[in-house]
Every structure is written in C-alpha cells, then in structure tokens.
Interface confidence: medium
C-alpha cells in the first residue's frame, strides 16, 4: 500500500510502526459544523418504529453519557396509528469507540474500547420460520 | 459532586483536573463479545426504509474505514413492496468519536474528533407545512 512519509515534527515514540500507546489531544474538533442540527431531532417520535432515548452513564468512560435508543413497541405503527405486530421494530446498532480510564480513576490515561450502542429503531419485515 | 480518589499508580500529567493531552492504549478492548454480530446485519434489506452501506475511508483517521448508510428511497416500502411517497425514509445519525492524526502523518499523536455518521434509515411521517 501507499506509505505516507512521516512528518519530521512528530513527537517521539519507541515504536514508529505500531504504536501501542499514543498521545491524544482531548480538545475535540467538531467536523459537524455544516449540518442542520434540527434534521434528526424528532425522528424518534415520528418514526413508524419510534424509540425512547435512555441514559447510559459510566464515569470511567469518555463520553461518560451516551443516549441509547430503546424501541417503544415490538411492532410498528401503521397508517391508523396502531401497532401492527406483523412488522417488527428493531434497534439499529453501531460499534463506537470510547475511552476507558486505565488504570481506573486515572485522569490522564485511557484505553480505547469498542462498545455496541443502539442509535435508533427501524421497521423490518419479520423472518418467518416455517415448521415442516 | 463525588470526587473519585485518584489512583496513585497513574502516569504523571501537568494538569490533574483537566487533562488536555492524555495517553491512550490502542489495544482495543471489545465489550461486545456476547453480542451476535449477524443480529442486525440484514436490517438494511428488510427495513421498510432500506439503505445501502458506503465506505468512507480516511488514512489520517482512526478508524480509517467507516461504513455510512444511505437511504435507497425517498419514500418507504409498503405492504405491497412498492415505494410509498406519503412516508419518508430518513437517515438516523449519530455523533461518534474518532482519532485524527495531528500533526498529519504522525503515527503516535492524535486529536479527538467528533464526526456525524449515518447508521441506518427509519421511516417517518412527513412534516406537512400548511400554507395560510
């Protein structure tokens, strides 16, 4: 593959090829400046598979609070506003990176961790298993 | 609020209360071992608001590859398998943390960055604007 030349102004490290421990600047840069913040704010209520936003908190993790989706119904909302159990509301999950304090309670030492979070819900056709 | 006692075995840092630069171990711990990775793998096809997954790649970012959802239709799939334009397929977006190499091309120095990604799609009732 392409090898990008190493910037001569980089901080020193013992292993240039595969850093196990790296320095991370926590001043978060936000790439979302051009997004319209209103656009997905009420989907949780307007969806045919609506969800609630539930607090998942862990003081030893950054971010310490993650809002997780919990589908309100097993079925989906039909045109009449009723729950249709011929369809299923299911959570859309995503693996995200978080920082975990390691050793515990240390303010400046972390380990990268992957966690699975539910972001919202979608309405799917159920898988029907036919019994022979 | 509660102050968690600082672990005496922590690495040194200049500012104990608000670290700007921290050490991060990149050996990822995965908390998702008990989850079934196939569980939501086919929702993108079975959803009434189906989506395609597009590769978003950036070698200066960790993770360098992120799969982004793009809704297939403006409307939603109805019971007959047709697209119903009285409903809208919309992307469910989530802010996620990534590591951005800083300075560029440095293997062991990063900055925390928040980016907005589309994880999947959901079917919503449209907002109807009535003209007076």
């Amino acid at each position: 593959g392409i090898t990008i030349p190493r910037n001569p102004g980089c901080p020193n490290s013992e292993d240039k090829n595969f850093p196990r421990t790296v320095m991370v600047n926590l001043n978060i840069h936000n790439r979302n400046t051009n997004t319209n913040p209103k656009r997905s704010s009420d989907y949780y209520n307007r969806s045919t598979s609506p969800w609630n936003l539930h607090r998942n908190e862990d003081p030893e993790r950054y971010p310490s609070v993650i809002w997780e989706a919990k589908c309100r119904h097993l079925g989906c909302i039909n045109a009449d506003g009723n729950v249709d159990y011929h369809m299923n509301s299911v959570p859309i999950q995503q693996e995200i990176l978080v920082l975990r304090r390691e050793p515990p309670h240390c303010p400046n030492s972390f380990r990268l961790e992957k966690i699975l979070v539910s972001v919202g819900c979608t309405c799917v056709t159920p898988i029907v298993h036919h019994v022979a | 609020g509660i102050t968690i006692p600082r672990n005496p075995g922590c690495p040194n840092s200049e500012d104990k209360n608000f670290p700007r630069t921290v050490m991060v171990n990149l050996n990822i711990h995965n908390r998702n071992t008990n989850t079934n990775p196939k569980r939501s793998s086919d929702y993108y096809n079975r959803s009434t608001s189906p989506w395609n997954l597009h590769r978003n790649e950036d070698p200066e970012r960790y993770p360098s590859v992120i799969w982004e959802a793009k809704c297939r239709h403006l409307g939603c799939i109805n019971a007959d398998g047709n697209v119903d334009y009285h409903m809208n397929s919309v992307p469910i977006q989530q802010e996620i943390l990534v590591l951005r190499r800083e300075p560029p091309h440095c293997p062991n120095s990063f900055r925390l960055e928040k980016i907005l990604v589309s994880v999947g799609c959901t079917c919503v009732t449209p907002i109807v604007h009535h003209v007076a």
Partner: antibody, heavy 124, light 107 residues
Framework: EVQLLESGGGLVQPGGSLRLSCAAS????????MYWVRQAPGKGLEWVSY????????IYADSVKGRFTISRDNSKNTLYLQMNSLRAEDTAMYYC?????????????????WGQGTMVTVSS | NIQMTQSPSSLSASVGDRVTITCQAS??????LNWFQQKPGRAPKLLIY???NLETGVPSRFSGSGSGTDFTFTISSLQPEDIATYYC?????????FGQGTRLEIK
C-alpha cells in the same frame, strides 16, 4: 468562576421572534451538553430543549417543536435559542443550564450550573 | 414522556422539624434523579444528584434516597433559610422532566 449568563429576553408581540443567548465562562464549554429550561410566572420548571456538546443532537419539548431552534457556537462559548411564532403561553423566565456529564474529569453532576435567567414576555 | 409526581404540593413545618418530600416516576429511572431548591426570584440550585449524592457545598441536613420509581428528599432539621420550592427531576430519559414542585413554608 464557572458562570452562565443569559440575555436577549424582552417584550414581543404574539407571532414575533426572539433570540436568546447564554454566554459560558470558567469551564470548557465544548465538552458539555446544554439545556434551556423555562418557568412561567408562578409555575413550575419546564424543560425546553437539549443540545449535545458539539451540536449534532438536538431534542425539543413538544410545546416548542417546530418553533424553537437550539444551537451553539463552541468557538464563542455561547448557547442560543431562536424562538419563532411566539405565543402568550411562551411567557416565562428562560434559564440555560449545563449538564455536567464530564465526571471523568471529576466535575459535578447533571444540571449543576444554571444561569440567572432572562425574562420573555409575549403580549399584544 | 416520563411523568414525575411530587407530593405534597405544599407543606408547612416548624424550625427544627424533619421534612420529607416524595417523588414518583412513571417508569424505572434507576437513580438518575436530581433535587433542586428554588428561592423566589432565583435560579434553581442543585442539592442532590443521582438520587442520594449531596452536591458540593450543600449542608448535610439535606439528603435523598430511593431508586427505580420511588424517591424521597429529606431535610433532617428545618432551618429558616430552607424556605423555598423544591423540585425533583429525572434525567434518565429524554425529554428530561420535572416534578410540579413542593412549596415549603415555616409555621
């Protein structure tokens, strides 16, 4: 000193607009989700809106949805509430509040810092 | 939305009395509950967070307990400066919701 200072309130006619601001100081604003909460005269507290630390997630109370827009400028350490199509029932003291979720930095608890409030009166 | 039912809506007590206010959530909120004090013309002040943790600088006569759906706020020995309205607030689910308030007066 950790502080929130609201401004932009005043008297406005029904159907009119106002933009409230909340200037933060004494803490790293960009790390904290923020809220607007209001209190009608002689009434209880009512949550109005939420915005995530970088502005990518916003949530509104049903009573203001489609009329109010919460936003933030992290470079200016300022939170905003754009209020359109104002109604008499929007008359209230409007407070901004910080959700101190950054406990990993050993700070306090949710809604630990509030501004002093700015009064919005909607009347003809 | 989660409903928070606070009781009583008002109460009158004497200096030195033990005062108890209850708050009931319409569904399980774990311990994600705050208690606030609000004096006339002032912004709310956080007293208790996570149901039972005393915020820094708050006198120890204030305490909180409970989890799930039932919560209690207690002032062990009422002082004249405690005259205020007290609110519970859940922050387990968005939208965040408050109790309707309890107005505390001195007899």
């Amino acid at each position: 000193e950790v502080q929130l200072l609201e401004s932009g309130g005043g008297l406005v006619q029904p159907g009119g607009s106002l933009r409230l601001s909340c200037a933060a100081s004494g803490f790293t604003f960009s790390f904290y989700p923020m809220y607007w909460v209001r209190q009608a005269p002689g009434k209880g507290l009512e949550w109005v809106s939420y915005i995530s630390s970088s502005g990518g997630m916003t949530i509104y109370a049903d009573s203001v949805k489609g009329r109010f827009t919460i936003s933030r400028d992290n470079s200016k350490n300022t939170l905003y509430l754009q209020m359109n199509s104002l109604r008499a029932e929007d008359t209230a003291m409007y407070y901004c509040a910080r959700e101190s979720v950054a406990r990993w930095l050993q700070s306090g608890a949710a809604f630990d810092i509030w501004g002093q409030g700015t009064m919005v009166t909607v009347s003809s | 939305n989660i409903q928070m039912t606070q009781s009583p809506s008002s109460l009158s007590a004497s200096v030195g009395d033990r005062v108890t206010i209850t708050c009931q959530a319409s569904q399980d909120i774990g311990t994600f509950l705050n208690w606030f004090q609000q004096k006339p013309g002032r912004a709310p002040k956080l007293l208790i967070y996570d149901a039972s943790n005393l915020e820094t600088g708050v006198p120890s006569r204030f305490s909180g307990s409970g989890s799930g759906t039932d919560f209690t706020f207690t002032i062990s020995s009422l002082q004249p400066e405690d005259i205020a309205t007290y609110y519970c607030q859940q922050y387990d689910y968005l939208p965040i919701t408050f109790g309707q308030g309890t107005r505390l007066e001195i007899k």
